[in-house]
């Protein structure tokens, strides 16, 4: 038994659970997902039994080996996978555990504006970046672009303080997860502050 292997996949993609076996005489190999049997292989007779019909077209063993390739990944394929190699030459089955994380490809992040104040010619507000469908494990970065600055800010909330008369600035939210990255539509400080002066309530940008 080796240490737990962490694997990452993307929705619609494929992942291969690598299996290198030194066992000479293999009687059977059993793959399970969250304790539910997934596939049983009996090398002697060349038998592969896929427990659930819906997985039949998603399961493959590339290059004639015993590594499991799972295709057309779905979010709920995330979980613990376990393989047991059974042999009459072994007292205990040889085992390996895997943890699979399946992530979605990120759509464009949405930006909302918080309450805004205009004091002494300075527009002060917060911009909040989020994913519409609440995707998990998303890291947000803000890019503030302008003649006077080119800065990055980590986190989903960007505090803004922009003085009327200053050169315009552009704000872009970048969202990342382990399998994809995307960015929001650009937001101009001047337009943001003009609009917010008319309507002080929180709004979509």
């Amino acid at each position: 038994s080796g240490p737990v292997k962490e694997l990452v996949g993307s929705v619609g993609g494929a992942v291969t659970f690598p299996l290198k076996s030194k066992v000479k005489q293999v009687d059977s190999i059993v793959w399970t997902f969250n304790t539910t049997p997934l596939v049983t292989i009996q090398p002697e007779g060349g038998t592969i039994i896929v427990t659930q019909n819906r997985n039949r077209e998603r399961v493959d063993f590339p290059d004639g080996g015993y590594s499991l390739k799972l295709s057309k990944l779905k979010k709920n394929d995330s979980g613990i996978y376990y393989v047991g190699i059974y042999s009459s030459s072994l007292q205990q089955p040889s085992t390996q555990e895997y943890v699979l994380h399946v992530y979605e490809h990120l759509s464009k992040p949405k930006v909302t504006m918080g309450l805004q104040s205009n004091k002494n010619g300075t527009c002060v507000t917060n911009l909040t970046c989020c994913m519409e469908h609440g995707e998990e494990d998303v890291i947000y970065t803000w890019k503030a672009l302008g003649q006077a600055a080119n800065e990055s800010h980590n986190g989903s909330i960007l505090p803004i303080s922009w003085r009327w008369g200053e050169s315009d600035m552009t704000f872009i939210c970048v969202a990342r997860n382990p399998v994809s990255r995307n960015f929001s539509s650009p937001i101009l400080a001047r337009k943001l502050c003009e609009g917010a002066a008319d309507d002080p309530d929180s709004s979509m940008v």
């Epitope: 993609g13 672009l145 552009t170 970048v174 994809s180 539509s185 650009p186």
Partner: antibody
């Protein structure tokens, strides 16, 4: 010094295969998306595809998806491009490129490796 | 695919002049555009990203502008070392695409 060095180019016959390598140094390779871009003689740049840090996502230009395979080995700080069924129009300088800060524009480029497809 | 069109394959200018290289996207790409310079026999070098932000170390005579479908790279006070090909790139959507390039010639 941040550096990308391509290798593996050369003369190959039509229908043949070739595997290009890109050795990265001077930065944490395992944290970056990486891309391949090619340039036919006297022509513009063409993006081939990209791979994310742990190889779980690979995006290709649709026209090249079925003949090129991008892979990487973070332990070796290396990026690879497997090219199959090569034709004369695949003759180009092939560059590996790193996106600035993991954005979408490329601030580090290799010197390129020339692939010539000819009989 | 989004097509990036650089209508001028060649542009001729003199040292000290100002020159504008244009790039047109076949659909709206916001400000997701970068510009590269490629000198003869060299790899491309990043000049501008997000349409108008200069990359570190790029002289301020290089200026990017535009949004939506029309983009411009302006070189003011052209120097002899600016002799190169210039390419635009969109990264608004997959696949990333480049313009065909504009070769800047110094008279």
């Amino acid at each position: 010094e941040v550096q990308l060095v391509e290798s593996g180019g050369g003369l190959v016959q039509p229908g043949g295969s070739l595997r290009l390598s890109c050795a990265a140094s001077g930065f944490d390779f395992s944290r970056y998306w990486m891309s391949w871009v090619r340039q036919a003689p006297g022509k513009g740049l063409e993006w081939i595809g990209e791979i994310n840090p742990d190889s779980s996502t690979i995006n290709y230009a649709p026209s090249l998806k079925d003949k090129f395979i991008i892979s990487r080995d973070n332990a070796k700080n290396s990026l690879y491009l497997q090219m199959n069924s090569l034709r004369a129009e695949d003759t180009a300088v092939y560059y590996c490129a790193r996106p600035d800060g993991n954005y979408w524009y490329f601030d580090v480029w290799g010197q390129g490796t020339l692939v010539t497809v000819s009989s | 695919d989004i097509v990036m069109t650089q209508s001028h394959k060649f542009m001729s200018t003199s040292v000290g002049d100002r020159v504008s290289i244009t790039c047109k996207a076949s659909q709206d790409v916001g400000i997701a555009v970068a510009w590269y310079q490629q000198k003869p026999g060299q790899s491309p070098k990043l000049l501008i990203y997000w349409a108008s932000t200069r990359h570190t170390g790029v002289p301020d005579r290089f200026t990017g502008s535009g949004s939506g479908t029309d983009f411009t790279l302006t070189i003011s006070n052209v120097q002899s070392e600016d002799l190169a090909d210039y390419f635009c790139q969109q990264y608004s959507s997959y696949p990333y695409t480049f313009g065909g390039g504009t070769k800047l010639e110094i008279k």
